[in-house]
Amino acid sequence: DQWSTQDLYNNPVTAVFNYQGLWRSCVRESSGFTECRGYFTLLGLPAMLQAVR
């Protein structure tokens, strides 16, 4: 499910890192939880992932 991982450690925002999969994108917050957004449809899905799906 993990396609790309972006390191955000030096970012002042509290996200540790985020990742995108075929069906959802998630942010791992340094407060200690994941916050995920699922894709019901192809709308709003990044072009590369639309193609893969």
Epitope: V13, T14, V16, R24, C26, V27, R28, E29, S30, S31, G32, F33, T34, E35, C36, R37, G38, Y39, F40
Partner: antibody, heavy 124, light 112 residues
């Protein structure tokens, strides 16, 4: 079905160490953070810290920094809490707790489940 | 640390009554992502805490609709519209917007 199964009751001597375990099932342990929470007899809940099973990163509450070590073995879906230099203040029930949130459109969900707790009694 | 002040400490009710529990945070719980990570748990004797309401007002799966959550700034409220025997126990509010995660001191809901 999401389950967090914790190890059994511990009776330990003052000054000793103890290792508690939390075995998860029903979800991918790498997808969520795993927290440990302490509850002393007849008292409230105290956050100890979290471990991210994806990479082993940990964050501890300052007061537990020198008391605990958290580890995870993703191959066995098991997280552990190691408590050292035990004193009577460490007598408590220790809970593991998995945490995450999300949504699919307007459908919101939470992943927030707790183990049954492990009772630790420190005797002098 | 964010201090979560819960009132009352004890709440005697009759079955069928409405019950209201308050929780005040010492600072804003709005996360940089726009969500407010304020949650309510119920702990019954000899059991682990169970999630009732997450992110202020969302009922967890399987939680009856007599439970509802609301907010006004840094004041948060859990309401039980008609108390049933299975609702008795200790209610905790909790925030995990900020590190460290903190909990309210608990409110014991008991039969009057």
């Amino acid at each position: 079905e999401v389950q967090l199964q914790q190890s059994g009751t511990e009776l330990v001597r003052s000054g000793a160490s103890v290792k508690l375990s939390c075995t998860t099932s029903g979800f991918n342990i790498k997808d969520y953070f795993l927290h440990w929470v302490k509850q002393r007899p007849e008292q409230g809940l105290e956050w100890i810290g979290w471990i991210d099973p994806e990479n082993g990163d940990t964050k501890y509450a300052p007061k537990f920094q020198d008391k605990v070590t958290m580890t995870v073995d993703t191959s066995s879906n098991t997280a552990c809490l190691h408590l050292s230099s035990l004193t009577s203040d460490d007598t408590a029930v220790y809970y593991c707790n998995v945490l995450g949130y999300g949504n699919y459109g307007h459908f919101y969900y939470a992943m927030d489940y707790w183990g049954q707790g492990t009772s630790v009694t420190v005797s002098s | 640390d964010v201090v979560m002040t819960q009132t009352p400490l004890s709440l005697p009710v009759s079955l069928g009554d409405q019950a209201s529990i308050s929780c005040r945070s010492s600072q804003s719980l709005v996360h940089s992502n726009g969500n407010t990570y304020l949650h309510w748990y119920l702990q019954k004797p000899g059991q682990s805490p169970k999630l009732l309401i997450y992110k202020v007002s969302n009922r967890f799966s399987g939680v009856p609709d007599r439970f509802s959550g609301s907010e006004s700034g840094t004041d948060f409220t859990l309401k039980i519209s008609r108390v049933e025997a299975e609702d008795l126990g200790i209610y905790f509010c909790s925030q995990n917007t900020h590190v460290p995660r903190t909990f309210g001191g608990g409110t014991k809901l008991e039969i009057r």
